[in-house]
């Protein structure tokens, strides 16, 4: 099946201190390689989460990514702060014969708006 990375929401709004889910699904796990979430684009993009076993404070996977046929790579960001605002991209990589892996497809991006916490 042809690989497609889908981020269904163009934007989400979340109150500061709350949590939000950023959705991402794939149509294929091939070619093998990791899936990562970034905020921003280009050289300055920031790694938010990687489905490769490392621990990321405040960010968790929504589905059981250890399922061998898992296609859901959505994440939950907890205790959102204004600094979390920006556009988030779900990115599929193909393993490289040497570092680094090769980015092969990105979702369309989900913009996160952080609303002031109601007093």
């Amino acid at each position: 099946k042809e690989l497609k990375v889908t981020q269904p929401e163009k934007s989400v709004s979340v109150a500061a201190g709350d949590s939000t889910v950023l959705n991402c699904t794939l149509t294929s796990l091939l070619p093998v390689g990791p899936i990562k979430w970034y905020r921003g684009v280009g050289q300055s993009r920031l790694l938010i989460y990687s489905f490769t076993g490392e621990h990321f404070p405040r960010v968790t996977n929504v589905s059981d990514a250890t399922k061998r046929n898992n296609m859901d790579f959505s994440i939950r960001i907890s205790n959102v702060t204004p600094e979390d605002a920006g556009t988030y991209y779900c990115v599929k990589f193909q393993k490289g014969p040497s570092e680094p892996d090769t980015e092969i497809q990105s979702g369309g991006g989900t913009e996160v708006y952080v609303l002031a916490k109601p007093s």
């Epitope: 796990l29 093998v32 990791p34 076993g53 059981d64 250890t66 399922k67 061998r68 046929n69 393993k95």
Partner: antibody
Framework: DVQLVESGGGVVRPGESLRLSCAAS????????MSWVRQAPGKGLEWLAG????????YYIDSVKGRFTISRDNSKNSLYLQMNSLTAEDTAVYYC???????????WGLGTLVTVSS | ALTQPASVSANPGETVKITCSGG??????YGWYQQKSPGSAPVTVI????KRPSDIPSRFSGSASGSAATLTITGVRVEDEAVYFC???????????FGAGTTLTVL
């Protein structure tokens, strides 16, 4: 330190059943997929079955499908392998192994010996 | 099926390469497992083609390209004498397989 300790091995007759256990410690067991791998005397390693972290998804090689069942109890940090209709060909050391994110293995138990003999 | 040489030998200090072929690069990740005696617990020396666990000496390295993976031991030592199994996970079939093992003798 990650520790995996298998138990439940022993000598059984052909056609009988056995349940192996693997006690895990030193890591968040409920976050990792797990597998069983065996090694027959004088032979190589053979992967048998794997299970997702939550326990909902299981995977087997064809030769044990329908005869072996992998399961886990995350509240007890334990992995299991129920083996039915055992034959002499099932004689082996059975290892539990922790899976990496891409379903290879990073930690192994010491193994438990299963002998099927009449 | 994964194919690896039955045996290799080297003098201390030499570089040893063990190859493993038979996987599809598009769908396969490789690992390497050291077993010092039959029935003893395997030790992972490489996973994810080229990732070395933190407690494994830096003389062990791994690579993969095309349909093959390679374990390299640079400056082999007597204590590296063991059987080395290559293993693979196939993302197309969801199945793990192992090679038959390569016996490394350090002369």
């Amino acid at each position: 330190d990650v520790q995996l300790v298998e138990s439940g091995g022993g000598v059984v007759r052909p056609g009988e059943s056995l349940r192996l256990s693997c006690a895990a410690s030193g890591f968040t067991f409920s976050s990792y997929a797990m597998s069983w791998v065996r090694q027959a005397p004088g032979k190589g390693l053979e992967w048998l079955a794997g299970i997702s972290a939550g326990g909902s998804d299981t995977y087997y090689i064809d030769s044990v499908k329908g005869r072996f069942t992998i399961s886990r109890d995350n509240s007890k940090n334990s992995l299991y392998l129920q083996m039915n209709s055992l034959t002499a060909e099932d004689t082996a050391v059975y290892y539990c192994a922790r899976e990496t994110w891409n379903h290879l293995f990073d930690y192994w138990g010491l193994g438990t010996l299963v002998t099927v003999s009449s | 099926a994964l194919t690896q040489p039955a045996s290799v030998s080297a003098n201390p200090g030499e570089t040893v390469k063990i190859t493993c072929s038979g996987g599809d690069y598009y769908s396969t990740y490789y690992g390497w497992y050291q077993q010092k005696s039959p029935g003893s617990a395997p030790v992972t020396v490489i996973h994810s083609d080229d990732k070395r666990p933190s407690d494994i000496p830096s003389r062990f390295s791994g690579s993969a390209s095309g349909s093959a993976a390679t374990l390299t031991i640079t400056g082999v030592r007597v204590e590296d004498e063991a059987v080395y199994f290559c293993g693979a996970y196939d993302g197309r079939t969801y199945i793990n397989t192992f090679g038959a093992g390569t016996t490394l003798t350090v002369l």
